[in-house]
């Protein structure tokens, strides 16, 4: 007869490991007992369990409650056992010794490999601001056994660097993603992808990029200067900019206070029916936590009874 087993049994942490040991004997041969032991190199054999043809299953105290026989029906020549709820410390060499009648004793070894799936974590880097050089956008760390693979999935242009730390029974892999921040990256996904033999599918953690910036400010509303005449209703100036975080707007008049009746509504300055006292230099001040911008315009309210129209001068400053 001969023993049938596996060279390597692989299980995921927390799963049950079936340690196979089947005696393929000639007709009339009987198995008296199957003794299982852990036999890691450099250490003495540690008894695991005994399957006895008469007495049944004995589990040694160190494995009490963790070793069982596979569910029925059972072949009397099958000495396989189940090791419940495999932990990392179970990884190692195991031996089954089969005592048969009349053929004698046989033994076989197998290696139990316990896969520890990673629990990845993603840590964003420092705040990204337009104008910075190469900056850390995010780092992703995953620890497992064996070492996991950590990669990035994104449309954003950048560079990656990885490092690995080996522990006694596992390895931690950290990958960093660096980029040169630009406003076009705002809202773009940056996804850390972790692969591991203990995972049914890759684990993905997505970070949405936020790049602080503030665009140049400009004022709209004076495109047709002939509309700015005495008595006109609904005249308004709108301040144009964009930024991250979204900017706030403030209106002032350079040559004095805002005239009465002029309404400030965020980025919009609304005028009552125009009079000559509305003529002047208006400044839109745009700011966010990142920066601030100004844009100023000169409003000249025309008197239709005067023959000559006046020029409107637009100035932008930052």
């Amino acid at each position: 007869g001969e023993l049938e087993t596996s060279d390597v049994v692989t299980v995921v942490l927390g799963q049950d490991a079936k340690l196979p040991c089947f005696y393929r004997g000639d007709s009339g041969e009987q198995v008296g007992q199957v003794a299982w032991a852990r036999v890691d190199a450099g250490e003495g054999a540690q008894e695991l369990a005994l399957l006895h043809s008469k007495y049944g299953l004995h589990v040694s105290p160190a494995y009490e409650g963790r070793v069982e026989q596979p569910p029925p029906p059972r072949n009397p020549l099958d000495g396989s056992v189940l090791l419940r709820n495999a932990v990392q410390a179970d990884e190692g060499e195991y031996e089954c010794r089969v005592s048969t009648f009349p053929a004698g004793s046989f033994q076989a070894r197998l290696r139990l490999r316990v896969l520890v799936p990673p629990l990845p974590s993603l840590n964003p880097g420092p705040a990204l601001e337009e104008g910075q050089g190469l900056t850390l956008a995010a780092s992703c760390t995953a620890e497992g056994s064996p070492a996991p693979s950590v990669t990035w999935d994104t449309e954003v242009k950048g560079t990656t660097s990885s490092r690995s730390f080996k522990h006694s029974r596992s390895a931690a892999v950290t990958s960093e993603f660096h980029l040169v921040p630009s406003r076009s990256m705002n809202g773009q996904p940056l996804t850390c992808v972790v692969s591991h033999p203990g995972l049914l599918q890759d684990q993905r953690i997505t970070h949405i990029l936020h790049v602080s910036f503030l665009a140049e400010a400009s004022v709209r509303g004076l495109e047709d200067q002939n509309l700015w005449h005495i008595g006109r209703e609904g005249a308004m100036l709108k301040c144009l900019s964009e930024g991250q975080p979204p900017p706030s707007y403030n209106w002032t008049r350079l040559d004095g206070p805002l005239p009465s009746g002029v309404r400030v509504d965020g980025d919009t300055l609304g005028f009552p029916p125009l009079t000559t006292e509305h003529s002047g230099i208006y400044v839109c001040h745009v700011s966010n936590e990142f920066s601030s911008r100004d844009s100023q315009v000169t409003v000249d309210v025309l008197d239709p009874q005067e023959d000559s129209g006046k020029q409107v001068d637009l100035v932008s400053a930052s």
Partner: antibody
Framework: EVQLVESGGGLVQPGGSLRLSCAAS????????MSWVRQAPGKGLEWVSV????????FYADSVKGRFTISRDNSKNTLYLQMNSLRAEDTAVYYC???????????????????WGQGTLVTVSS | DIQMTQSPSSLSASVGDRVTITCRAS??????LAWYQQKPGKAPKLLIY???SLQSGVPSRFSGSGSGTDFTLTISSLQPEDFATYYC?????????FGQGTKVEIK
């Protein structure tokens, strides 16, 4: 015919020592694990100690650990129990017994005791 | 240590009676259980091993059953020579432990 004959019992004072012997015949002595079991007067059976076939493993009941030592001389087919620091509660008939040999090379379990000697009485009293 | 509890501690029966003694283990011991008979002034004698296997030379009126924690010794038809004390013993772990004994007396 399997035979186990104990000797060495007797009266001893508390704190004293005694060495019990068990002469075996009728079987291949070094192929079997051997045990000592005792029985206090009018009481039940209490396992004391076991020694593996080649003497490599020895186990003791907590009640005698550190005081009793089991040993064997396979060349003389004899089992021994050295008893030191004896107490009144050690008073009992001491039996040597052979373990049934149907478990091979597995120390975590014991097997039934298929042959017993006639016993030797140890009395600890002042 | 595993505790073995026998019941009853004693019983009175007549020749020809069917006698049942039970033994309970404090934890599962598969079939690592033996039954012994002891007569006054004599050494114990192995009757049953592996919970239900009859030791060579033991009359077939003795039988054992059970597995795990609950075990039974049955004498199908009590004979005069069966009046004795009976002990169960677990040998699943070291130390092996005995029940406190059941004394079978003549009614």
């Amino acid at each position: 015919e399997v035979q186990l004959v104990e000797s060495g019992g007797g009266l001893v004072q508390p704190g004293g020592s005694l060495r019990l012997s068990c002469a075996a015949s009728g079987f291949i002595f070094d192929g079997y694990d051997m045990s000592w079991v005792r029985q206090a007067p009018g009481k039940g059976l209490e396992w004391v100690s076991v020694i593996k076939d080649h003497g490599g493993y020895k186990f003791y009941a907590d009640s005698v650990k550190g005081r009793f030592t089991i040993s064997r001389d396979n060349s003389k087919n004899t089992l021994y129990l050295q008893m030191n620091s004896l107490r009144a509660e050690d008073t009992a008939v001491y039996y040597c017994a052979r373990e049934y040999s149907d478990v091979v090379d597995y120390v975590s379990v014991r097997t039934p005791l298929d042959y017993w000697g006639q016993g030797t009485l140890v009395t600890v009293s002042s | 240590d595993i505790q073995m509890t026998q019941s009853p501690s004693s019983l009175s029966a007549s020749v020809g009676d069917r006698v049942t003694i039970t033994c309970r283990a404090s934890q599962g011991i598969s079939s690592y259980l033996a039954w012994y008979q002891q007569k006054p002034g004599k050494a114990p004698k192995l009757l049953i091993y592996a919970a239900s296997s009859l030791q060579s030379g033991v009359p077939s009126r003795f039988s054992g059953s059970g597995s795990g924690t609950d075990f039974t010794l049955t004498i199908s038809s009590l004979q005069p020579e069966d009046f004795a004390t009976y002990y169960c013993q677990q040998h699943y772990t070291t130390p092996p432990t005995f029940g406190q004994g059941t004394k079978v007396e003549i009614k």
